[in-house]
């Protein structure tokens, strides 16, 4: 079958990194500069992705594979294949249309990305606040007052960590 296909379509013999040049009797020609073909039998080469501005080059384009970008420091990748770059903020902040803004009282963000999330409400688990929350850190819940009374045999283990919030993508 492969031999038959080759006889019918000479382009199928063109390897990755080349294209089947209709202008030259379907000879396999190398991809021009700044282009690539990642599979054989291509009739054109694809233009290499350019990593510029907010993007920087993580992997150079070759004749057989596209360039890969990441983000210039101060920004982080979003989307498949780093299709976008989003601004970093400091811990204790979240990104808004107006840029990085401090977390409101009662919320925190311990990362350079994502949104400010409410402090854990210790009382919902019958616990007390052991360490106060800040813009950068969640509160630490301690044992309930009852657990600290004389004769209490053991300290209640801390509540399991909540699933952290994620930056919308």
């Amino acid at each position: 079958f492969e031999r038959t296909r080759s006889l019918q379509d000479p382009c199928s013999n063109c390897p990755a990194g080349t294209f089947c040049d209709n202008n030259r009797n379907q000879i396999c020609s190398p991809c021009p500069p700044n282009s690539f073909s990642s599979a054989g039998g291509q009739r054109t080469c694809d233009i290499c992705r350019q990593c510029k501005g907010v993007f920087r080059t993580r992997k150079e384009c070759s004749s057989t594979s596209n360039a890969e970008c990441d983000c210039t420091p101060g920004f982080h990748c979003l989307g498949a294949g780093c299709s976008m770059c989003e601004q970093d903020c400091k811990q204790g902040q979240e990104l808004t249309k107006k840029g990085c803004k401090d977390c409101c009282f009662g919320t925190f963000n311990d990362q350079k990305r994502g949104i400010c999330r409410p402090w854990t409400n210790c009382s919902l688990d019958g616990k007390s606040v052991l360490v106060n929350g800040t813009k950068e850190r969640d509160v630490v819940c301690g044992p309930s007052p009852a657990d600290l009374s004389p004769g209490a045999s053991s300290v209640t283990p801390p509540a399991p960590a909540r699933e952290p919030g994620h930056s919308p993508q």
Partner: nanobody
């Protein structure tokens, strides 16, 4: 091909003014939020300003508020940054950048940017 090309940079004295332009081709400018970002020598990238599709919303980083003005002319597929009362710390390469699909709703990601134009503030 989607492309952004900045121009208008140059050498200016402290206190002076400069107007940067960004020409957009290969897409309809009026469909997108647009941004200016900058990179000072040896520093990371810093967001400067953004503007919504029709120019009714504009936001700035605190350090340029009241000195810089972002604007757009969708009919000319152009974005602008008017910079006045320039300071040495404004020295940077300035890039215009397009807000990706869903910008301001799902994320604040930038998906296309230009090569940049250099602004040097020095006496």
């Amino acid at each position: 091909q989607v492309q952004l090309v900045e121009s208008g940079g140059g050498l200016v004295q402290p206190g002076g003014s400069l107007r940067l332009s960004c020409a957009a081709t290969g897409f309809t400018l009026s469909n997108y939020w647009m941004n200016w970002v900058r990179q000072a020598p040896g520093k990371g990238l810093e967001w400067v300003a953004n503007i919504n599709q029709d120019g009714s919303e504009k936001y700035y980083v605190d350090s340029v508020e009241g000195r810089f003005t972002i604007s757009r002319d969708n009919a000319k597929s152009s974005l602008y940054l008017q910079m006045s009362s320039l300071r040495a710390e404004d020295t940077a390469v300035y890039f215009c950048a397009r807000g990706g699909e869903g910008y301001g709703v799902d994320h604040y990601g930038l998906d296309v940017s230009g090569q940049g134009t250099t602004v040097t503030v020095s006496s």
